[in-house]
């Protein structure tokens, strides 16, 4: 669980000719508000689907009245952040739509009137817990500047907010099978919280909120004993529909035991037999002490002298891992800005900068956007080389002169038609096919080849599986 936060910095006329008329006037004062809609994934169809990750509406901004004869300035904005809480994992890749709405406060009969001034959309990658990301988007002659981030709500941590952390119960170490919770080293990973009501005897979970059944049990909460009389296979995940055991992976498949541990199946789950020096449910906890010299590459070992006291290796620059055994690819952190080439020289990092940039990390832009033109509502962005344009939706190329055709790759299957709608590509399927990409045949009896229709949808409804 966590919160996506959006901070609007400015909304006003973009650079270049054709400045928009102010949306407010002395006769018709108005104020702005914003709506954000989030959808998971980077797929084009995200724009057609509901705001599956969530949506939020800002407060109303201050009332604004245009000064006669003055050009439209940046318009006064609402206070505060737009916050979109998400209950499940943060997907890492997401699509957004930000709408700017105008509330007219003139002598409207029946209260204020609202109209949509601008809509921008985009697809981004974002790790939870990271810094604020800045963005500029154009919508016609308007320009929206904003920042966004995703942060986890305690006790969740990690780039997807899926790991749970709790304060340590003992000062020196975490419980069996539980690791320290980086970056909060004074906390420990918490046991997973399974779906509410999941049987503690017959169910388990590997992700929060799920309930997976042990052998011999079925049902959404693993409370229904399986009848094995009509079943062929002696083991496997239970089928809730038949009450039967169907073939499937055993608990030891893929060997869940770490560090060379051997796995054996038990009536309820599995058991790891760990090699000397390791213990825990999956042999992931080391019983080694600092006396055994476990830290490689000059790492400094800190910890107690007895096997029950965990040790920690403090690694020198350039190394990582619980035993400092991994060399850090420091270039993987992409320290060189603006497309600079990263060179890891061992003792130091070097950035080889592209034309137009300088500085130890290529952070200094030697070239501003003066006199540079980006076509079709594109914005010239400082820091992208000699001249980089951030293009409006639907345009691409160095100067945004090329129309980006999302249909060029022919994404609609079986003769379906692809349309370049402003919100993303849209497929209209040929008769006999359905799905967001026309990938599913519709059987003559009206049923589709889909495994199952989502709740509330008939299988015969086309293009709704988004």
């Amino acid at each position: 669980a966590g919160v996506f936060e959006l901070q609007i910095h400015s909304f006003g006329p973009g650079p270049g000719p054709g400045a928009p008329r102010s949306p407010c006037s002395a006769r018709l004062p108005c104020r702005l508000f914003f709506r954000v809609c989030l959808k998971p994934g980077l797929s084009e169809e995200a724009a057609e689907s509901p705001c599956a990750l969530g949506a939020a509406l800002s407060a109303r901004g201050p009332v604004y009245t245009e000064q006669p004869g003055a050009p439209a300035p940046d318009l006064p904005l609402p206070d505060g952040l737009l916050q979109v809480p998400f209950r499940d994992a943060w997907p890492g890749t997401f699509s957004f739509i930000i709408e700017t709405w105008r509330e007219e406060l003139g002598d409207q009969i029946g209260g204020p009137a609202w109209s949509l001034l601008a809509r921008v959309a985009g697809r981004r990658r974002l790790a939870a817990g990271g810094p604020w990301a800045r963005d500029i988007q154009r919508a016609g002659a308007w320009e929206l500047r904003f920042s966004y981030r995703a942060r986890c709500e305690p006790p969740a941590v990690g780039t997807a907010c899926t790991r749970l952390c709790r304060p340590r119960s003992a000062p020196s170490r975490c419980g069996p099978g539980l690791r320290p919770c980086a970056p909060l080293e004074d906390e420990c990973e918490a046991p997973l919280v399974c779906r509410a009501g999941c049987s503690p005897e017959h169910g388990f979970c590997e992700q929060p909120g799920e309930c997976r059944c042990l052998e011999g049990w079925t049902g959404p909460l693993c409370t229904v004993p399986v009848s094995t009389s009509s079943c062929l296979s002696p083991r496997g995940p239970s089928s809730a529909t038949t009450g039967c055991l169907v073939p499937g992976p055993g608990p030891c498949d893929g060997n869940p035991c770490a560090n060379g541990g051997s796995c054996s199946e038990t009536p309820r789950s599995f058991e790891c037999t760990c090699p000397r020096g390791f213990y825990g449910l999956r042999c992931e906890v080391s019983g080694v002490t600092c006396a055994d010299g476990p830290c490689f590459n000059g790492g400094l070992c800190v910890g107690g002298a007895d096997p029950d006291s965990a040790y920690i290796c403090h690694c020198p620059p350039g190394f990582q891992g619980s035993n400092c055994e991994k060399r850090v690819d420091r270039c993987s952190l992409q320290p060189c800005r603006n497309g600079g080439l990263c060179l890891d020289l061992g003792h130091a990092l070097r950035c080889r900068c592209r034309a137009g940039f300088a500085g130890p990390r290529c952070e200094h832009d030697l070239d501003d956007c003066a006199g540079r033109a980006c076509a079709n509502g594109g914005t010239c962005v400082e820091g992208g080389g000699a001249h980089r344009c951030s293009c409006a939706l639907g345009f691409g190329g160095r100067d945004c002169r090329e129309r980006a055709d999302p249909c060029a790759a022919r994404p609609c299957a079986h003769g379906g038609r692809c349309y370049a709608h402003f919100s993303g590509l849209v497929c209209a399927c040929a008769p006999g096919y359905m799905g967001a990409r026309c990938e599913f045949p519709v059987h003559p009896d009206g049923a589709s080849a889909l495994p199952a229709a989502p709740p509330g949808l008939r299988p015969g409804d086309p293009q709704r599986y988004l």
Partner: antibody, heavy 118, light 109 residues
Framework: QEQLVESGGGLVQPEGSLTLTCTAS?????????MCWVRQAPGKGPEWIAC???????TDYASWAKGRFTVSKASSTTVTLQMTSLAVADTATYFC???????????WGPGTLVTVSS | QVLTQTPSPVSAAVGGTVTISCQST????????LSWYQQKPGQPPKVLIY???NLEIGVPSRFKGSGSGTQFTLTISGAQCDDAATYYC??????????FGGGTEVVVK
């Protein structure tokens, strides 16, 4: 600014022929759209005639328009509608319109008037 | 595919609510590929709503579309004098077929 402009309308005799042209500006047919013709008789509602899908050049017609009307792409910015065996009932304003998704016409031309009269 | 609009004409006072219905003889594509247009004399139709309920950019929020399958409604809440016009529904059907409704004239008094 994306725009459509129709041309080629005018007075034509019954049983005569006429070709209308739709010219796009601000965009081209290199992207995938349905470029369509819709007509509206005086005092009546709009009536769909035909479309050409710019993605692959395939065409679709209203059942009543098949045979007498032909839609084609003349260039990357022009679409034409050829009309034959015109009758007085074909008198209408003919609009060029674009569907760029979800089956609606988000961009229209101002229309060109075709009068069929002897 | 025939779209039938009711009623016509319809009259409303300024600030009042106007409701126009549109019924199709068969389900539109995707159950929601239906749009609404406003037309004033001498002008082409202007789209208000697409995909049954999506407001086109620049259209005041007093216009609202709803419905799915074969039955759709356009509602104008707090009608203004400028809303006096003829309104048309238009559907898109499987097989790449388009159809328009017969229109509903709205008078605002």
């Amino acid at each position: 600014q994306e725009q459509l402009v129709e041309s080629g309308g005018g007075l034509v005799q019954p049983e005569g022929s006429l070709t209308l042209t739709c010219t796009a500006s601000g965009f081209s047919f290199s992207s995938s759209y349905d470029m369509c013709w819709v007509r509206q008789a005086p005092g009546k509602g709009p009536e769909w005639i035909a479309c050409i899908y710019t993605g692959d050049g395939s065409t679709d017609y209203a059942s009543w328009a098949k045979g007498r009307f032909t839609v084609s792409k003349a260039s990357s910015t022009t679409v034409t509608l050829q009309m034959t065996s015109l009758a007085v009932a074909d008198t209408a304003t003919y609009f060029c319109a674009r569907n760029s998704g979800y089956g609606y016409f988000g961009l229209w031309g101002p229309g060109t008037l075709v009068t069929v009269s002897s | 595919q025939v779209l039938t609009q009711t009623p016509s004409p319809v009259s409303a006072a300024v600030g009042g609510t106007v409701t126009i219905s549109c019924q199709s003889t068969e389900s539109v594509y995707g159950s929601d590929w239906l749009s609404w247009y406003q037309q004033k004399p001498g002008q082409p139709p202007k789209v208000l709503i697409y995909q049954a309920s999506n407001l086109e950019i620049g259209v005041p929020s007093r216009f609202k579309g709803s419905g799915s399958g074969t039955q759709f409604t356009l509602t104008i809440s707090g009608a203004q004098c400028d809303d006096a016009a003829t309104y048309y529904c238009q559907g898109y059907y499987s097989g790449y077929i388009y159809a328009f409704g017969g229109g509903t004239e709205v008078v605002v008094k």
